[in-house]
């Protein structure tokens, strides 16, 4: 790995609890100021694999509320608008990191956790399982 | 919002940093573990929208390593192999939440910054502008 | 090898029409979408339309749409642009370039091979 | 609609790195090729798939491309690279082909 030169003005840490417990500023920086945010919103709708999006909130976590998606049909949409079988709606799939508070209820104190998350939905050619 | 009771066995956290402050263990707790990690491992190659995986790595950032997709071909793959221009293959885009050295160089203190990324490609009908 | 040769540049009147053609050789042309792309006498290069390989799909710059056809014959391995309600600003060399995709959809190369360019003068 | 946007010229000694500039809202996230243009000739793929390069393009050539900019570097720059350079990606909003509006690259 890369190794960083230390910043003398960083906060002090004990090697025992290094680096398990860290410091983390909640004051989110956002890096995607020039981002269109409607861009990919009609996306779910006009994809040939289409999905719905579920809000799944959990108090305990942060952030609490995360969408997730569910790709509407077994098939694909064709170009007549009509469910074609011979592909497959599959959920696009993400690993992402999450704050979960612990202990529980706690508000200053918190986790890391990696959930999956379904983003979306992509249309795949299935894999053919042939009879011997 | 939900109120929830604040746990007795919290951590103290003067008010005057709360909620910009707090503390995170970093030993990451995984849900996933019932997860099939290669089950989606292929949908890049057999998507009607395929794409390719690019690695973003930045050691100011946890997790330092982040794989990002980009689409192949501005149409999808038809039933034949060739590139539909019918359609638009488009990245499905997530808002993720990463931990950034803040000050840098900092192995102990970090700021939450919400980055978009570029999880894959999904196929969908352009939208067609007329003129005039 | 492969190539494209553009033809039927020259000096039009703004309002006027003109047709210009690409002969492809050397690769299978129904495989792939083509373009054209021009360039003012200075200037940058500025795409102006997309074709797919079997010519369902097209594509125009605003600047030029619904003034610009876009067409292909397969069967004579034929790439064509029709210019009308032509005016100053269309005056460049236009060139047909070539996108290639491989059969499986593995790799995508737009303007991978280009034509030596054809000269529109739009002037009275 | 997406633009990208190029210094509009360059200068390097001979045997120099040259770094020509490529930039536009959240490029990483888009493909980026780069055309080599000679004055009176048309234009050459130099680079595809933001650091692909076509067999014939020497290895000199190179690209990258993260945040909101794309590179193409020429090490050991040579006086018969001097030429015009454009960057160029697609943009699925308007199924459009941009460029960017081209560096002049001159080899001292």
């Known amino acids: 790995g890369i190794t960083i030169p230390r910043n003398p003005g960083c906060p002090n840490s004990e090697d025992k609890n290094f680096p398990r417990t860290v410091m983390v500023n909640l004051n989110i920086h956002n890096r995607n100021t020039n981002t269109n945010p409607k861009r990919s919103s009609d996306y779910y709708n006009r994809s040939t694999s289409p999905w719905n999006l579920h809000r799944n909130e959990d108090p305990e976590r942060y952030p609490s509320v995360i969408w997730e998606a569910k790709c509407r049909h077994l098939g694909c949409i064709n170009a007549d608008g009509n469910v074609d079988y011979h592909m497959n709606s599959v959920p696009i799939q993400q690993e992402i990191l999450v704050l979960r508070r612990e202990p529980p209820h706690c508000p200053n104190s918190f986790r890391l956790e990696k959930i999956l998350v379904s983003v979306g939905c992509t249309c795949v050619t299935p894999i053919v399982h042939h009879v011997a | 919002g939900i109120t929830i009771p604040r746990n007795p066995g919290c951590p103290n956290s003067e008010d005057k940093n709360f909620p910009r402050t707090v503390m995170v263990n970093l030993n990451i707790h995984n849900r996933n573990t019932n997860t099939n990690p290669k089950r989606s491992s292929d949908y890049y190659n057999r998507s009607t929208s395929p794409w390719n995986l690019h690695r973003n790595e930045d050691p100011e950032r946890y997790p330092s390593v982040i794989w990002e997709a980009k689409c192949r071909h501005l149409g999808c793959i038809n039933a034949d192999g060739n590139v539909d221009y019918h359609m638009n293959s488009v990245p499905i885009q997530q808002e993720i939440l990463v931990l950034r050295r803040e000050p840098p160089h900092c192995p102990n203190s970090f700021r939450l910054e919400k980055i978009l990324v570029s999880v894959g490609c999904t196929c969908v009908t352009p939208i067609v502008h007329h003129v005039a | 090898q492969v190539q494209l040769v553009e033809s039927g540049g020259g000096v039009v009147q703004p309002g006027g029409s003109l047709r210009l053609s690409c002969a492809a050789s050397?690769?299978?042309?129904?495989?792939?979408?083509m373009h054209w792309v021009r360039q003012a006498p200075g200037k940058g290069l500025e795409w102006v339309s997309l074709i797919s390989g079997d010519g369902g799909a097209t594509y125009y710059a605003d600047s030029v749409k619904g003034r610009f056809i876009i067409s292909r014959d397969n069967s004579k391995n034929s790439l064509y642009l029709q210019m009308n309600s032509l005016r100053a600003e269309d005056t460049a060399v236009y060139y047909c370039?070539?996108?290639?995709?491989?059969?499986?959809?593995?790799?995508?190369?737009?303007?991978?091979?280009w034509g030596q360019g054809t000269l529109i003068t739009v002037s009275s | 609609s997406y633009e990208l946007t190029q210094a509009p010229s360059l200068s390097v000694s001979p045997g120099q790195t040259a770094n020509i500039i490529c930039s536009g809202d959240n490029l990483r996230t888009k493909y980026v090729s780069w055309y080599q243009q000679k004055p009176g000739q048309s234009p050459l793929l130099v680079i595809y798939?933001?650091?692909r390069r076509p067999s014939g393009i020497p290895a000199r050539f190179s690209g990258s491309n993260s945040g909101n900019t794309a590179t193409l570097t020429i090490s050991g720059t040579q006086t018969r690279d001097e030429s015009t350079y454009y960057c160029m990606t697609w943009d699925v909003d308007t199924t459009s082909m941009i460029f960017g509006g081209g560096t002049k690259l001159t080899v001292l």
């Open positions: 370039a070539r996108h290639f995709s491989d059969s499986r959809g593995r790799s995508d190369v737009p303007f991978d091979i």
């Open positions: 050397g690769f299978t042309f129904d495989d792939h979408a």
């Open positions: 798939q933001d650091t």
